[in-house]
């Protein structure tokens, strides 16, 4: 059962796993959620009745029954992990904590103009977990405006104390705001010989890389495959770090693979979600339960629905035994990974999908692309919405893209003459416009947020957000698309599609079926040559064939230019403007979404 509210002046008795320090009960709840075993927690707030050494302690707890006895205690705040909830979770914490000193290893000290600059420095430093900044009112003159970057083994402070005129906060790497290089390569036959901070068992290098990414101290990893000569090290995932943040020594070794933490590529890749099945593989761990199941998929479902289950092994039924049902072993361990991995015993193993909600929903697999043809099929572009106006009569106005459960990203120029959000309707999961009848459900629009520098499409800033009145429940036919990550700014996208119900030629009508066209990106330099009378800025991106023939057109505005990279779809552009439609040497011009990620996050995450 999902319980989100916090219990004031309440302490859970027993079940302690570990104690960490957090600046707030809210953040304690996040830490509990991300801990492999924590189901409940008790946080101690600052209080005159409480021993100051216990202030800001966050005690992480577990219980077989998923609850613990409650005791009244002043200044204690208790609650449950979000593991039991189905809503999306994020580790992103932008809060700044005033008059708190978060203790850790101070490894870098420099002068900064503001707390924001200090936080940016922390976000762009590979080792930094959190920071403390002495404001210009700090009593000690030589420490004023000093930005201390800090790290710890756990990623959380080792202690938190009250200190006047300082502020503290966390790195925003988990908010996808780091400018650090995103290094996606996995190197075969390679061992990184730097110091190990931890080791876990993993079925493949991809899982090892994902574990490294969400481990607070891991910067790169080495994985020994099941063919590794030393038997005791097979399937071993070594989590590593170095002072420079980069591997210092690379050794060529067969049957080993190495790679990097993807912390600065966050939101573009699944990090917590290990969705594959591993055949002829047994995961060992503490046994939680053994249940009958028809298939390994059913076993994974059972594991996902059991809040304490972390991974499973399914042994298929022997012929005609137990109504064709096999045995599903639900398992757990102290760190969420198997304690040992065995091969050749006929089991099928995998992980809970409960943690998938900690990844951005947009990274989950969708229907494979239908190659060829111009009409889309249902579920092919589940982020695409049709935006209707009801005034003077109801009609399709523009396209748009779902980027969050209450947010649509579209073009600012769509709202010329739109006086109020009340006349707008957003329809999702639609393939044919003819499906939209009077009784078709839609989302009302609560607010239209147009970029304040927008004047006209051709001069840029052609971007707008719609805040919906109600939240979108994600399904196969309506789900979000990922925003491009700033760490991926230099990716060259080669698989880009424009979609919409717009005209198929300049003088035409809105199409009934959602149309799609694969269109290559064009460099801004090339695009500028085609539009001598306009300034093509870096905040724009162009796409089109030199010979024309395929393009967005009237009615497609606001819709997505969707590009697939590393099996994940990204919203690279918003259909904005162009000269005519599909004309020779006149590419379409799109709003370059990566340049507006900060603006989008600022608007969608504003309290």
């Amino acid at each position: 059962e999902c319980v989100t509210q916090l219990l004031k002046d309440t302490c859970f008795e027993g079940g302690d796993i570990t104690t960490v320090f957090t600046p707030s009960a809210k953040y304690c709840q996040v830490v509990c959620t991300y801990h492999p075993r924590c189901l409940l927690f008790t946080f101690t707030a600052e209080s005159p009745s409480e021993d100051p050494t216990r202030w800001f302690t966050c005690v992480l707890k577990d219980s077989v029954t998923e609850t613990l006895p409650r005791v009244n205690r002043t200044a204690a705040i208790s609650g449950y992990s979000f593991k039991q909830c189905s809503h999306q979770i994020s580790a992103c914490n932008k809060d700044i904590y005033v008059d708190l000193d978060m203790k850790g290893i101070n490894y870098n000290s420099s002068v900064a103009k503001s707390a924001q600059e200090c936080q940016e420095r922390c976000t762009d430093d590979v080792h930094c977990h959190f920071f403390t900044y002495a404001t210009r009112q700090f009593p000690s003159l030589e420490h004023r405006n000093i930005c201390l970057l800090k790290h710890t083994q756990t990623g959380t402070p080792t202690r938190i104390t009250k200190l006047d005129k300082v502020v503290s906060g966390f790195s925003l790497k988990s908010c996808a705001l780091s400018n650090l290089a995103c290094i996606r390569d996995i190197f075969p036959n390679t061992v990184f010989a730097d110091s190990n901070i931890d080791s876990v068992m993993a079925p493949d290098a991809f899982v090892c890389g994902r574990i490294c990414t969400h481990h607070p101290g891991c910067l790169f990893f080495t994985f020994f495959s099941q063919e590794w000569p030393k038997e005791s090290q097979r399937n071993l995932c070594l989590l590593k770090t170095s002072e420079s943040g980069l591997p210092s020594t690379r050794i060529k070794k067969s049957k080993a693979l190495s790679g990097f933490s993807l912390q600065s590529c966050r939101h573009s890749i699944p990090v917590f979600c290990h969705s594959s099945f591993y055949h002829d593989t047994d995961f060992l761990g503490e046994e939680l339960d053994i249940v009958a199941a028809k298939s390994h998929e059913a076993c994974q479902k059972l594991c996902t629905n059991a809040v304490r289950c972390q991974f499973f092994t399914y042994t298929p039924a022997q012929a005609s035994c137990n109504e064709g049902k096999g045995k599903c072993y639900l398992k757990l361990s102290s760190n969420g990974s198997p304690t040992k991995i065995l091969h050749g015993r006929g089991g099928i193993s995998g992980y809970t999908l409960r943690l998938c909600k900690m990844d951005n929903e947009c990274t989950t697999k969708i229907k494979p692309r239908i190659v060829g043809g111009t009409a889309s099929v249902r579920g092919e572009w589940p982020w695409q919405v049709t935006l209707h106006t009801t005034s003077p009569t109801q009609r399709h106005l523009c396209g748009g893209s779902i980027i969050g459960n209450q947010w649509i990203l579209t073009a600012a120029h769509c709202f010329y003459g739109v006086e109020s959000p009340k006349i707008l309707r957003v329809y999702s999961g639609i393939l044919n416009q003819s499906e939209i009848k009077e009784d078709t459900s839609f989302f009302g629009v609560q607010e239209i947020i147009i970029h304040d520098q927008y004047k006209m499409a051709e001069s840029g800033y052609d971007i707008a957000l719609l805040k919906l009145e109600t939240t979108v429940n994600y399904t196969d036919s309506q789900r979000p698309i990922c925003l491009p990550s700033k760490g991926d700014r230099n990716v060259i996208y080669t698989d880009c599609w424009v979609t919409g119900w717009g005209y198929r030629k300049l003088r035409d009508k809105i199409q009934n079926t959602l149309q799609k066209a694969k269109i290559p990106l064009v460099t801004n330099e090339e695009c500028q040559k085609r539009y001598r009378g306009h300034k093509i800025t870096h905040k724009m991106i162009c796409a089109g064939y030199r010979e024309g023939g395929k393009d967005a057109c009237k009615g497609d505005s606001g819709g997505p230019l969707s590009c697939k990279h590393n099996e994940v779809w990204h919203l690279v552009g918003i259909t904005s403007w162009g000269e005519g439609c599909a004309q020779r040497e006149r590419p379409g011009v799109y709003t370059n979404v990566v340049e507006y990620v900060d603006w989008i996050l600022e608007k969608t995450q504003a309290v």
């Epitope: 762009d124 290089a181 390569d185 420079s244 690379r250």
Partner: nanobody, 124 residues
Framework: QVQLVESGGGSVQAGGSLRLSCAAS????????VGWFRQAPGKGLEGVSA????????YYADSVKGRFTISQDNSKNTVYLQMNSLRAEDTAVYYC?????????????????WGQGTLVTVSS
């Protein structure tokens, strides 16, 4: 003693090409980030391109994407910047820099070692 030496600068007509080289001694490009930066007259330092030599991951400023290509020759401990379709606004002193940490690739503040620079002049 670390030394980075740039070469290959010069004067060229708009639309022309140049290839800059950066050779290192006392510092190995392998396992490190190497960046090209430029400073136009009266302007600040601007990140142009960078490479992480271990896997060859490359990074480019939007203003040069599609025109400039960064590459490496680990055996010669040299990094190259191939500049095509040059424009007047590419006129600047080009610097090669080496980082010893994981960095935001186009942020000059995080690079440790710097060359003396080579002048590129593009006339229209």
């Amino acid at each position: 003693q670390v030394q980075l030496v740039e070469s290959g600068g010069g004067s060229v007509q708009a639309g022309g090409s140049l290839r800059l080289s950066c050779a290192a001694s006392g510092y190995t490009f392998n396992n490190n980030f190497v960046g090209w930066f430029r400073q136009a007259p009266g302007k600040g330092l601007e990140g142009v391109s960078a490479i992480y030599s271990l896997g060859g991951s490359t990074y480019y400023a939007d203003s040069v994407k599609g025109r400039f290509t960064i590459s490496q020759d680990n055996s010669k401990n040299t990094v190259y910047l191939q500049m095509n379709s040059l424009r007047a606004e590419d006129t600047a002193v080009y610097y090669c820099a080496g980082a010893i940490t994981w960095v935001p690739p186009l942020s000059h503040r995080r690079y440790t070692y710097w060359g003396q620079g080579t002048l590129v002049t593009v006339s229209s």
